[in-house]
Interface confidence: low
Amino acid sequence: AAADLIVRGPPGPPEAVTIDEITDTTAQLSWRPGPDNHSPITMYVIQARTPFSVGWQAVSTVPELIDGKTFTATVVGLNPWVEYEFRTVAANVIGIGEPSRPSEKRRTEEALPEVTPANVSGGGGSKSELVITWETVPEELQNGRGFGYVVAFRPYGKMIWMLTVLASADASRYVFRNESVHPFSPFEVKVGVFNNKGEGPFSPTTVVYSAEEEPTKPPASIFARSLSATDIEVFWASPLEKNRGRIQGYEVKYWRHEDKEENARKIRTVGNQTSTKITNLKGSVLYHLAVKAYNSAGTGPSSATVNVTTRKP
């Protein structure tokens, strides 16, 4: 007796995947079915790859579900001005088949940028500076050539925005230098985007402070005492006179009498702490100490130097 042995399996790879039409966010594809391996093809899935993706990724299509008798579909939700290639995968009740060979590579068309820079912030810098920073927009979200940033800022509470155009996709920092910038003053800041197609949106407005002025007055009433052969305690008072420049902490400098001051060691305190302990010193040694206030702009003038000798070991 004769018998036919039919071996059913997942479909073979579809063939001739073609990009028929491409816009800024869509691509219309067509393909030919491969062998169904004796089990009807029930659906197709489309995958895409770009220079920015990790391997092949499934993409959204219209129709959302592509049945086995449909050989065209529109891929939606693509990023403008990105080079894409596509492939299709067929499936039947037995399983998912091998993917087709990739289509040709095609770039989507340009569009206005839509993604704003992340983490707009700033601060610091030198006197009379407003430093503004942000995270650059990834290339795949720039939506076109000629990408750049528009930095807008104004003193907090003022009406008029000052604008600066940075025609570089890599820009992530802008420094406004002007003698009228008062130390540690609040500014409203936002960063917008543009490309050859035009201007996109601005980031949400955030408040950034201009650069501080370093403390202008020295700490007062410096006093030091030996606690042991290895430890000294230093005390001081915040500046007596009105000090310009916020004080973030104090820097205590100490050096042995036989050493040069430029070889001094430094320790920093944080906040309004006005004493500190210096440890790991040598016994019966004369030390010189001085204290300065500091903030993000730098250190202020030094206090008078005081002397203290550690106890005998």
């Epitope: 003193p155 509470g157 003022k158 009406m159 008029i160 000052m162 406004f176 003698e179 009228s180 008062h182």
Partner: antibody, heavy 123, light 102 residues
Framework: AVTLDESEGGLQTPGGALSLVCKAS????????MFWVRQAPGKGLEYVAE????????WYAPAVKGRATISRDNGQSTVRLQLNNLRAEDTGTYYC????????????????WGHGTEVIVSS | ALTQPSSVSANLGETVKITCSGS???YGWYQQKSPGSAPVTLI????NRPSDIPSRFSGSGSGSTGTLTITGVRAEDEAVYYC?????????FGAGTTLTVL
Amino acid sequence: AVTLDESEGGLQTPGGALSLVCKASGFTFSSFNMFWVRQAPGKGLEYVAEISGGGGSTWYAPAVKGRATISRDNGQSTVRLQLNNLRAEDTGTYYCAKSADTWSYGAATIDAWGHGTEVIVSS
Amino acid sequence: ALTQPSSVSANLGETVKITCSGSSGSYGWYQQKSPGSAPVTLIYDNTNRPSDIPSRFSGSGSGSTGTLTITGVRAEDEAVYYCGGYDGSTDVFGAGTTLTVL
């Protein structure tokens, strides 16, 4: 002593343009914001425009926004107000004023005034 | 806009207080003796008095209110007094307070 001298305003025609210049002396001009303030006949003081010491920042009152331009020449110690598309309600005395601090947050910081110049907008 | 009384009166030698409200920043106080004459700055930034201004003029600011105080008012103090400040959107002056010395 600080002195601020405004140029003559005079009679202007509606729809025309006004240019006022203020010459400053007696202080480090580039370090201070400058203002133009005006007073209509029988009315109170009205803030018009402000410019920062370096000239990079300008602010305008709503009544003149889009019509006014304030600028400065730190080399010549002058500040200029250009007011276009003049209206009858622009009539008044225009004062040049100096901010009290190197970074001014509003008219509250004026510490010196010019003598004022009269502007009449009439056909 | 900034709000200040339209008029106040005082006898010679009395203390006068003129208030101003509506500023989100500091206040300044300006004296104008006749319309069209240049204003004179009495107080800037709430409390600072220019060196050529008599000490009988003083200023204070608390919250959203600024106050100009004239201690021992004189006949020559008769004038219109303007406050200046920032109303949250623009720099503004009050409508002015006329001081009459009796």
